[in-house]
Interface confidence: low
């Protein structure tokens, strides 16, 4: 039998589930842990202080908890402040917590004291400098000023002028006396220790406004944006650059040391980024307002004026169209154009359309068409209804048949089919 059916092995409301290995396992509700949910979860009571994260575990049948403390706190329940949080140790000393809960600093060489802030004076502890060298204390250390003929951190070595070599930048040192030397410098350097970089720029070949930048036994040309190459002799094709050097659809033509733009209509300027002000040459009439557009302009007309330049009187002002018509003005000649509503016709839309006499009868099922102002009416024959007599009247809707008879709708009338034992028009 499945292990979970044999009476649940889970205590305290634990839910029994069967593992792939056919063993039973318990899914414990909050507050309970253990293989059979038999142990109280020690984390349930929130034993960790502050933002400490509680983790429970079961060891040898006993439920235990541990707290993962946030920065600045320590202890089994995160209730103790961390004395190292304030970085009390100076000069890179390592901070740890002592058995008394206070901080301990492991001082680096050259420093001492509880917080490693005190400098050790190495010059007072014996005489570290050899051969009569003068000891100079420095923060965290010391240095020796050696007498002539000695060298090394402690003046321990007899001075050999070329060991180590004082020659910089790859220069070769040659001993020229007991304490003297010469440096043979590599091309591009000069000076006592080859420390001076020779200026290679005099007589440079940087062209087209290129700036010479001195290198080591060489120079480089820093070119203006229009030129490139070793000596700025190579023209930069601005037309290949992204984004395009010519804006607003302008065509780019590369030139030596620059480029030129051919602008499309309506644009001007070196890179075709200026919109030509077409209002500068526009002639809007009668106090109209000119609005510049790309390669065109627009005149905003005052009341009563129309046309591209507002030079025409607006014929619509006098309401020449029938009341429901829409009036527009012809921008060329200023005349009114009336757009008629359904049922009206004519230049001013004031003539009624006789819908009954144009084309086929609009009324269905032989209905009679009657013209009206702007529309028409249909007078329907018996048995039909609707605006165009398109709907058959269902005479059965009023339930005229009696004694459970069946009603049959007919055009303009109805028929009752009577039950056995009844007769009459209505089976009455």
């Amino acid at each position: 039998a499945p292990p979970c059916l044999d009476g649940s092995p889970c205590a305290n409301g634990g839910r029994c589930t069967q593992l792939p290995s056919r063993e039973a396992a318990c899914l414990c509700p909050p507050g309970w842990v253990g293989e059979r949910c038999q142990l109280e979860d020690p984390c349930h009571s929130g034993p960790c202080a502050g933002r400490g994260v509680c983790q429970s575990s079961v060891v040898a049948g006993t439920a235990r908890f541990s707290c993962r403390c946030p920065r600045g706190f320590r202890g089994p329940d995160c209730s103790l402040p961390d004395p190292c949080l304030s970085s009390p140790c100076a000069h890179g000393a390592r901070c740890s917590v002592g058995p008394d809960g206070r901080f301990l600093c492991s001082c680096p060489p050259g420093y001492q004291g509880r917080s490693c802030r005190s400098d050790v004076d190495e010059c007072r502890v014996g005489e570290p400098c050899r051969h009569g060298g003068t000891c100079l204390n420095t923060p965290g250390s010391f240095r020796c000023q050696c007498p002539a003929g000695y060298t090394g951190p402690l003046c321990e070595n007899p001075a050999v002028p070329c060991a180590p070599s004082p020659c910089r930048n790859g220069g070769t040192c040659r001993q020229s006396g007991d304490l003297t030397y010469d440096c043979a410098c590599l091309p591009g350097f000069e000076g006592q220790n080859c420390e001076v970089n020779v200026d290679d720029c005099p007589g440079h070949r940087c062209l087209n406004g290129g700036t010479c930048v001195d290198g080591v036994n060489t120079y480089n040309c820093q070119c203006p944006p229009e030129w490139t190459g070793q000596f700025c002799t190579e023209d930069v094709d601005e037309c290949q650059l992204q984004p395009n050097a010519c804006h607003n659809g302008g065509t780019c033509f590369n030139t030596l040391g620059g480029h030129s733009c051919v602008c499309v209509n309506g644009w001007t300027g070196e890179s075709c980024s200026q919109n030509i002000d077409d209002c500068a040459t526009a002639v809007c009439f009668h106090g109209a307002t000119c609005h510049d557009r790309v390669a065109s302009f627009y005149c905003a007309c005052p009341m009563g004026k129309t046309g591209l330049l507002c030079h025409l009187d607006d014929a619509c002002v006098s309401n020449p169209c029938h009341e429901d018509a829409i009036c527009d003005t012809n921008p060329v000649n200023g005349r009114a154009i009336c757009t008629c509503p359904p049922g009206f016709t004519g230049g001013a839309c004031d003539q009624d359309v006789d819908e009954c006499s144009i084309g086929a009868n609009p009324c269905e099922h032989l209905g009679r068409c009657v013209n009206t102002q702007g529309s028409f009416l249909c007078q329907c024959g018996r048995g039909y209804t609707g605006p165009r007599c398109e709907t058959d009247v269902n005479e059965c809707l009023s339930g005229p048949c009696r004694n459970q008879a069946t009603c049959l709708d007919r055009i303009g009338q109805f028929t009752c089919i009577c039950m056995a034992g009844f007769t009459g028009t209505y089976c009455e």
Partner: antibody, heavy 122, light 110 residues
Framework: QVQLVESGGGLVKPGGSLRLSCAAS????????MNWVRQAPGKGLEWVGR??????????HYAASVKGRFTISRDDSKNTLYLQMNSLKTEDTAVYYC?????????????WGQGTLVTVSS | DIVLTQPPSVSGAPGQRVTISCSGS????????VSWYQQLPGTAPKLLIY???QRPSGVPDRFSGSKSGTSASLAITGLQAEDEADYYC???????????FGGGTKLTVL
């Protein structure tokens, strides 16, 4: 845009010869010093040699490992760099790249070609 | 003969900062500029840093270079998966009129 395309690589027996080409486009070829750099399979980059443009003297320098066996040349009228490899050894097996030298100071190689593989094997 | 020394490999997690060192001598790095190249798997090297610390256009400012004495280093901040590649330092040796490359460093993004 600036482009370098190498060709001529292939399989050759030890002691044999091969000529690599590098076709350049998109810049004034004669103004630039050109370099060959190689990379043995799974290994690092090794400089092979360089040739200055004719207008700057056309001087040529080689790495010690190829001196006397390899010859670098250029044809500025064809915008093409060449590497003639003679007396090939198995250790010459590598991808060979050509690269434009933007400045000798600091070895500024930009751009590089896609490379061509030379295999020296018996 | 490799005359510029680089660590064979470095690694870092996404978002981290890594540095690659390049050690030379007074006859190469000591008196010249250093360049750095990035070589993504199966592709040709690409210029990453020139004149010790200059970035070509198109190279993100996460990449930076520096030089001190006879050593140079490349730093990459905010590490991304696409930074996984081989990195080479390079300079010019004036004494032998030749270019030299470091042995290369393989960067792995964990």
């Amino acid at each position: 845009q600036v482009q370098l395309v190498e060709s001529g690589g292939g399989l050759v027996k030890p002691g044999g010869s091969l000529r690599l080409s590098c076709a350049a486009s998109g810049f004034t070829f004669s103004s630039y010093t050109m370099n060959w750099v190689r990379q043995a399979p799974g290994k690092g980059l090794e400089w092979v040699g360089r040739v200055k443009g004719e207008q700057f003297g056309g001087s040529i320098h080689y790495a010690a490992s190829v001196k006397g066996r390899f010859t670098i040349s250029r044809d500025d009228s064809k915008n093409t760099l060449y590497l003639q490899m003679n007396s090939l050894k198995t250790e010459d097996t590598a991808v060979y790249y050509c690269a434009r030298e933007r400045s000798r100071a600091g070895s500024i190689f930009d751009p590089w070609g896609q490379g061509t593989l030379v295999t020296v094997s018996s | 003969d490799i005359v510029l020394t680089q660590p064979p490999s470095v690694s870092g997690a996404p978002g981290q900062r890594v540095t690659i060192s390049c050690s030379g001598s007074s006859s190469n790095i000591g008196f010249n500029y250093v360049s750095w190249y990035q070589q993504l798997p199966g592709t040709a090297p690409k210029l990453l840093i020139y004149y010790n610390n200059q970035r070509p256009s198109g190279v993100p400012d996460r990449f930076s270079g520096s030089k001190s004495g006879t050593s140079a280093s490349l730093a990459i901040t905010g590490l991304q998966a696409e930074d996984e590649a081989d990195y080479y330092c390079s300079t010019w040796t004036g004494t032998s009129e030749s270019h030299v490359f470091g042995g290369g460093t393989k960067l792995t993004v964990l």
